[in-house]
C-alpha cells in the first residue's frame, strides 16, 4: 500500500481547470525528492506530463504546473483549459515514475450539459453583469419583447417591453430595444445571484411567427485563486470588480468557520486589529480595481479571502467578489528577523531588513506605516540617498551586511518614533517585511555631547563614552550625509569615567577634527558594530563658527548643549500616496535633503594607526 494519497476520481467539464492535491509523508527524503504527474498509457508505462524539476510536456505547455509544499507534505498539480482528450488514468507520485511511491487518479472531462440547438452560453461570476442578446426578424420589431426563465417544464416571465419586471430581478435588470434598423434587443442583469443560474428564453412577437433564442446562464462562485506565499513575506491581492462598482465601497474579508466573512480592511476605514501595521489598501484606479498588500505573513493568515464591493463595506449576496485561497509556506526562503525592535528615548535602533539575495542591485527602501483610512507608507529613506527632511542626521540605510540583508539605523529616538515600519525594495514584492519599533524606559548606552560649536581653523575633540558591555565591539565615528555615514578616524583614549560600577572595559573614543573647516559642519555619529552588524549609535551636531578665541576646544558631556531643534517637514513636500509602494520610483519627487558636503567631512585626525579604529561604514 502506497503512503501517497490523493483524489481517486476527478471530474470536470471542457474548458475548466482542475487543481489536484497529492499528499505524502513529509520525511526529509520525501520532501526533497522529485514529484511528478504522469499519464498511464496502454503499454502500462506512465509518461511524465509535469514534474517538480520544471519539466512540462508539450501537451501541457502553458496550461499546467506542479507546486511542492514540503512543510505540508503535499504537492498540487494545476491543469487548465481541459479538453475531453485529457480524460484518462494518471498517477501522482514521488521519485521515479516506474518504481516510486504513487497514487492512481482517474480524470474524467465531459462536454457539459446537453442544451437546445443554437443555445448561447453565458458564463459569469456571481455579482457581475451579463448582457443577453436576443435577435428578431423585421416583422416582430413592433411586437412585445420578453425574457423568460425555464424552470422545469414551465417558463416564468422575467422582464418584458411592457415594463413588467419579476420581483426577483427588481432594481437589477433592464431590457434595451435599439433604434430602428437594429434587429436585436438586449437584457442586462446586474449583480448576478447564484439563483439566476439556468436556461432562459428570449422571445419577440407571438404565435407561430415569433422569434425565440435560448440562453444558458451559468453563474459561478468565483473560483478561489490559489496563492502560495512564504512565512514572514508579503502577499498582494489584486481586485478588479468592474466599472459598475467603481464608486462603491471596497473590502477584503476572510471566510471564517461559520461561513461568514470577517472584514480585514475596507475603504470605509475599518481594519482588523490582527493586521495592524502590516496591511495597506492601495487606492483604486479609474476602473475601480484596487489591491491589498499584507506583509509579515503568519501561519494563521492562511484561509479563504474575498474582495468585493458594497456600500456597507462588507460581503453581501449578489455583489461582485473575487476569491483567493492563501497558503503560507513555513519552509520560508525569507530569513527570520526581529518583528519588534526596542529602543530607549534618546537612544537608537538598528533594524535588519531582508531582501531577495538574487536582487542585490535592487533599490532598498524603508517606510513608516500609517494606519489612517486605508493605510499608507511614506518613504523615509532609500539606498540612493533620499531621506525625509525631518529625519536629517538621524536616519541611514546601509547596504551591509549584504547578501540578502540591509540595515536601517534610526537614532535620537523619541516616543513619536514608536510604530510600524516596512522594509521593501523595487524588486521582489514578496520580500516586504514589517518591524515594530517600541520605545521603552531606559537610558542610551552611548554618551555624547548634545550639540557642539567648533571654531574655524582650530582643533575639535568630540568624546563618546561606551559602557563595558561593548568591550568586544568595534567602535567608530562617522559623518552623516543623506547618502550614508562615512567613517572617520577616531582615537581610543582609554577607560571612560562616565560609567561607574564598570571595569577597564568601558572606553572613551574621541573624534578629532584638526583643523576645523566649514565642510566639517553637520551630523556625526559614534557607534558600535560587530563585523557588518551594527549596534547602537549616538548623534552629535557640530556647528562651525568664525574664530573668536585662540586655542583648541575640548568638549565634555558636562558642557554639552541641548540638541538643535529638529527641522520641520516642509509643507511643500508632496504627500506620498500608498500606491507608490507598488512602484517606489514614484517617490523620486520627494524633497531630497541637501548633501552636507564632503563625506570625509574634512576630518584630519592626526592619530597613529595603533589607536585608530578603521570602520567600513556604509558601503554605498
Amino acid at each position: 500500500k502506497s503512503p501517497v494519497f490523493g483524489p481517486q476520481e476527478v471530474s470536470s467539464v471542457e474548458g475548466n481547470s482542475v487543481s489536484i492535491k497529492c499528499y505524502y509523508p513529509p520525511t526529509s527524503v520525501n520532501r526533497h525528492t522529485r514529484k511528478y504527474w504522469c499519464r498511464k498509457g496502454a503499454s502500462g508505462r506512465c509518461i511524465t506530463l509535469v514534474s517538480s524539476e520544471g519539466y512540462v510536456s508539450s501537451n501541457y505547455a502553458g496550461r499546467a504546473n506542479l507546486t511542492n509544499f514540503p512543510e505540508n507534505g503535499t504537492f498540487v498539480v494545476n491543469i487548465a483549459q481541459l479538453s475531453r482528450d485529457d480524460s484518462g488514468h494518471y498517477k501522482c507520485g514521488l521519485g521515479i515514475n516506474s518504481r516510486g511511491l504513487s497514487f492512481d487518479v482517474s480524470l474524467e472531462v465531459s462536454q457539459g450539459p446537453e442544451l437546445p440547438n443554437g443555445t448561447e452560453v453565458y458564463t459569469v461570476d456571481v455579482g457581475r453583469t451579463v448582457t443577453i442578446k436576443c435577435p428578431f426578424k423585421t416583422e416582430n420589431a413592433p411586437k412585445t419583447k420578453a425574457l423568460y426563465k425555464k424552470i422545469g417544464q414551465t417558463s416564468v416571465l422575467v422582464i418584458d417591453s411592457r415594463n413588467y419586471v419579476n420581483p426577483n430581478y427588481k432594481d437589477r435588470i433592464r431590457l434595451r430595444i435599439p433604434g430602428t434598423g437594429q434587429l436585436i434587443f438586449t437584457v442586462v442583469i446586474d449583480r448576478l445571484r447564484l439563483s439566476d443560474h439556468g436556461l432562459y428564453l428570449c422571445q419577440a412577437g407571438d404565435g407561430s411567427n415569433r422569434d425565440e433564442k435560448n440562453a444558458d446562464l451559468q453563474v459561478l462562485e468565483p473560483e478561489p485563486e490559489l496563492v502560495y506565499e512564504d512565512l514572514r513575506g508579503s502577499v498582494t491581492f489584486h481586485c478588479a470588480l468592474g466599472l459598475e462598482v467603481a464608486n462603491v465601497a471596497k473590502f477584503l474579508c476572510r471566510v471564517n468557520s461559520r461561513e461568514t466573512c470577517d472584514v480585514v480592511i475596507n475603504t470605509l476605514g475599518k481594519r482588523d486589529s490582527a493586521f495592524e501595521g502590516r496591511i495597506l489598501l492601495n487606492p483604486q484606479d479609474k476602473d475601480g480595481s484596487f489591491s491589498v498588500v499584507i506583509t509579515g505573513l503568519r501561519k494563521e493568515d492562511e484561509g479563504r479571502y474575498l474582495c468585493g464591493a458594497h456600500s456597507d463595506g462588507q460581503l453581501q449576496e449578489g455583489w461582485p467578489i473575487q476569491a483567493w485561497q492563501l497558503f503560507v509556506n513555513e519552509e520560508s526562503t525569507i530569513p527570520r528577523s526581529p518583528t519588534v525592535v526596542k529602543g530607549v528615548a534618546g537612544g537608537s535602533v538598528a533594524v535588519l531588513c531582508p531582501y531577495n539575495p538574487k536582487e542585490s542591485q535592487s533599490l532598498k527602501y524603508w517606510c513608516l506605516w500609517e494606519g489612517a483610512q486605508n493605510g499608507r507608507c511614506p518613504l523615509l529613506v532609500e539606498s540612493q540617498g533620499l531621506v525625509q527632511e525631518q529625519y536629517e542626521g538621524r536616519l541611514s540605510l546601509l547596504q551591509e551586511p549584504g547578501n540578502g540583508t540591509f540595515t536601517v539605523i534610526l537614532n535620537q529616538l523619541t516616543t513619536q518614533d514608536a510604530g510600524f515600519y516596512w522594509c521593501l525594495t523595487n524588486g521582489d514584492t514578496r520580500w516586504r517585511t514589517t518591524v515594530e519599533i517600541k520605545i521603552i524606559e531606559g537610558e542610551p548606552n552611548l554618551k555624547v555631547p548634545g550639540n557642539v560649536t567648533a571654531v574655524l581653523g582650530e582643533t575639535l575633540n568630540i568624546p563618546c563614552h561606551f559602557p563595558c558591555k561593548f568591550s568586544s565591539y568595534e567602535k567608530y565615528w562617522c559623518k552623516w550625509s543623506n547618502t550614508g555615514c562615512q567613517t572617520l578616524p577616531s582615537q581610543d583614549e582609554g577607560p571612560s569615567e562616565a560609567f561607574v560600577n564598570c571595569d577597564e572595559n568601558s572606553r572613551l573614543v574621541s573624534l578629532t577634527l584638526n583643523p576645523v573647516t566649514r565642510a566639517d559642519e553637520g551630523w556625526y555619529w559614534c557607534g558600535v558594530k560587530q563585523g557588518h552588524f551594527y549596534g547602537e549609535t549616538a548623534a552629535v551636531y557640530v556647528a562651525v563658527e568664525e574664530k573668536k578665541v585662540a586655542g583648541s576646544r575640548y568638549v565634555s558631556p558636562a558642557k554639552a548643549d541641548a540638541a538643535p531643534d529638529e527641522k520641520v517637514l516642509d509643507s511643500g513636500v508632496r504627500e506620498i500616496e500608498n500606491k507608490a509602494i507598488q512602484d517606489p520610483r514614484l517617490f523620486a519627487e520627494e524633497k531630497v535633503v541637501a548633501d552636507t558636503g564632503d563625506q570625509a567631512g574634512g576630518s584630519r585626525a592626526s592619530v597613529d594607526s595603533s589607536s585608530s579604529e578603521e570602520q567600513g561604514g556604509s558601503s554605498k
Epitope: F5, P7, Q8, E9, V10, S11, S12, V13, N16, S17, V18, S19, I20, Y23, N72, T74, G112, L194, L220, E221, E223, P224, V255, S257, R258, E259, T260, G303, R304, E317, Q325
Partner: nanobody
Framework: EVQLVESGGGLVQAGDSLRLSCAAS????????MGWFRQAPGKEREFVTT??????????YYADSVKGRFTISRDNAKNTAYLQMNSLKPDDTAVYYC?????????????????WGQGTQVTVSS
C-alpha cells in the same frame, strides 16, 4: 451555521447494499467539501470518503478499505451528499457521520471539518 442530517442507515446482510444521504441546510454557500467518517464501538473515528468541489469540478477521495465498493456523489441543487455502499462486510458496521468543511487542507483529518451530523447506524450481519 450549517446543519447536517444523515439518513438511510439500517441493518443489512453481508454482500448487500445501502445508500446513505446527508442533507445540508443553512449557510451552505461557501461549503467546499462533504464527507463521511465512521466510528465502530471502542475505535477511533475513521475517514471513509469525501467529495470536494470547485465550480463544475468534483474531487472524490476514498479510504483504501472501501475503494471500489463505496461511491460518494452529491446533488448540488439539493445540497445533499450520498454514499452508495455495495458489497458490505461485517467490518463496515459502525455509526456513519456526515461532515462538511469550508476549507480542507487534508480530507482524511476529522478536525479539518467544521460541521458534523448526529450520525446514522449501519449494521452488517454475517
Amino acid at each position: 451555521e450549517v446543519q447536517l442530517v444523515e439518513s438511510g442507515g439500517g441493518l443489512v446482510q453481508a454482500g448487500d447494499s445501502l445508500r446513505l444521504s446527508c442533507a445540508a441546510s443553512g449557510r451552505t454557500r461557501t461549503t467546499y467539501g462533504m464527507g463521511w467518517f465512521r466510528q465502530a464501538p471502542g475505535k477511533e473515528r475513521e475517514f471513509v470518503t469525501t467529495i470536494t468541489w470547485s465550480g463544475p469540478t468534483n474531487y472524490k477521495y476514498y479510504a483504501d478499505s472501501v475503494k471500489g465498493r463505496f461511491t460518494i456523489s452529491r446533488d448540488n441543487a439539493k445540497n445533499t451528499a450520498y454514499l452508495q455502499m455495495n458489497s458490505l462486510k461485517p467490518d463496515d458496521t459502525a455509526v456513519y457521520y456526515c461532515a462538511a468543511s469550508t476549507v480542507l487542507t487534508d480530507p482524511r483529518v476529522p478536525t479539518e471539518y467544521d460541521y458534523w451530523g448526529q450520525g446514522t447506524q449501519v449494521t452488517v450481519s454475517s
